[in-house]
């Protein structure tokens, strides 16, 4: 797009570049545990990793950010890691009246970009 | 969202956090001088500034990788800013029988967040 | 809808300020190009400058540079051109223009006008 | 500073086609915008970039670019078609340059 291209291949070695990466969590770091009922360990995807120059780029306006980093560091910020998608999860959570089930469009990653 | 809040007041000071900034740049540093008319610089704006605690969280994901970066820094990265929404601009295109124009939606940045 | 209405007509002294609004509905405020044009009694369309509120600058035509300043307040959706030294051949309909924008260009295509507003200048 | 030339006025019988032009030096490497406006409102826009039309416009108008003569196309005319067109485009500096604009007159 904008005749500047997306690259897929990771320049700095395996598994440095923006990628997705299970974390795991409890409620109580997520300060959760007075309200959801489970799972009481979540395993959650998170995008890290670097985002070197034209590496998974997002959209044209992330493959002018990194043209315009490489020119202008101090004043433009290079692309960053950050989710593309999602996937749904589902919390049980306790209500004044019980138990109910949610779902959540926006807690899990699925995949990752640099934007 | 999911009992933490993301919040809209810089800590850190004017100016510091996410917020969408205008850059100026040249065809020749976007490299297309070849294929794109412009008699001025083009403006763009551009999402820049740091993504403390909470701070304009994009959602329910963001303010968990909030909280755990937090708690795991060297693990989960800080959210950072990205654009959430863009203005679609018009670029005059060189072609083969001339000029034309063409439409980019994501081009240029029109509201920021912490993703 | 796009909407852009303008304020009423002004009668002014040579040597004053007129101060005219365009206010915006429908459609992002910020994601466009707002223009103005000036239409003098029996002539053509004159383009005096224009505002991108999402950059915050404002370009002027040569020939008004230094006597118009057109700004606009983003939480009302109000561009506002503002023209000063009044003389008699200032006389004219005054039209905002919304278009989209264009790179390194800035102004034109301008797909929604408002209704005008007269200005009238004379002692 | 970059001038569009166009004629003062232009005549046609209904139900003919019309053409207006815009003359500019080497035009045909510009974009071009063509506007109609009647009398006592604002100018509409009917032709953008050769020849796209805005929602709305009817297919009847189309526009032409070359050399240094842009030309605005107005087949089958009708009577609501009678008004001012102006020509629209930009000079070195990126600035909006309107021609002069011609009136069209449908007989009949």
């Known amino acids: 797009s904008a005749h500047l291209h997306p690259r897929d291949s990771c320049p700095l070695g395996p598994g440095r570049c923006c990628h997705l990466e299970t974390v795991q969590a409890t409620l109580e770091d997520l300060g959760w545990s007075d309200w959801v009922l489970s799972p009481r360990q979540l395993q959650l995807s998170m995008c890290v990793g670097e985002c070197p120059h034209l590496y998974r780029s997002a959209n044209t306006h992330a493959l002018i950010k990194a043209r315009l980093h490489g020119l202008q560091p101090d004043r433009v910020p290079a692309p960053c890691c950050v989710p593309s998608s999602y996937t749904p999860v589902v919390l049980m959570h306790r209500t004044d009246s019980g138990v109910s089930l949610q779902t959540y469009d926006d807690l899990v990653a699925q995949g990752c970009h640099c934007a | 969202s999911a009992h933490l809040h993301p919040r809209d007041s810089c800590p850190l000071g004017p100016g510091r956090c996410c917020h969408l900034e205008t850059v100026q740049a040249t065809l020749e540093d976007l490299g297309w001088s070849d294929w794109v008319l412009s008699p001025r610089q083009l403006q763009l704006s551009m999402c820049v500034g740091e993504c403390p605690h909470l701070y304009r969280s994009a959602n329910t994901h963001a303010l968990i990788k909030a909280r755990l970066h937090g708690l795991q820094p060297d693990r989960v990265p800080a959210p950072c800013c990205v654009p959430s929404s863009y203005t679609p601009v018009v670029l005059m295109h060189r072609t083969d029988s001339g000029v034309s124009l063409q439409t980019y939606d994501d081009l240029v940045a029109q509201g920021c967040h912490c993703a | 809808q796009v909407q852009l209405v303008q304020s009423g007509a002004e009668v002014k002294k040579p040597g004053s300020s007129v101060k005219v609004s365009c206010k915006a509905s429908?459609?992002?405020?910020?994601?466009?190009?707002v223009s103005w044009v000036r239409q003098a009694p029996g002539q053509g369309l004159e383009w005096m400058g224009g505002i991108i509120p999402i950059f915050g600058t404002a370009n002027y035509a040569q020939k008004f540079q230094g006597r118009v300043t057109i700004t606009a307040d983003e939480s009302t959706s109000t561009a506002y051109m503002e023209l000063s030294s009044l003389r008699s051949e200032d006389t004219a309909v005054y039209y905002c223009a919304r278009g989209p924008i264009i790179m390194g260009y800035q102004f034109g295509l301008f797909d929604h006008w408002g209704q005008g507003t007269l200005v009238t200048v004379s002692s | 500073s970059y001038e569009l030339t166009q004629p003062l006025s232009v005549s046609v019988a209904l139900g003919q086609t019309a053409r207006i032009t815009c003359s500019g030096d080497n035009i045909g490497s510009h974009i071009v915008s063509w506007y109609q406006q009647k009398p006592g409102q604002a100018p509409v826009l009917v032709i953008y970039?050769?020849?796209n039309r805005p929602s709305g416009i009817p297919e009847r108008f189309s526009g032409s670019n070359s050399g240094n003569t842009a030309t605005l196309t107005i087949s089958r005319a009708q009577a609501g078609d009678e008004a001012d067109y102006y020509c629209?485009?930009?000079?070195?500096?990126?600035?909006?340059?309107f021609g002069g604009g011609t009136k069209l007159t449908v007989l009949g």
């Open positions: 629209q485009t930009w000079d070195s500096i990126g600035s909006v340059v």
């Open positions: 429908g459609g992002t405020f910020r994601s466009y190009a």
């Open positions: 970039d050769k020849s």
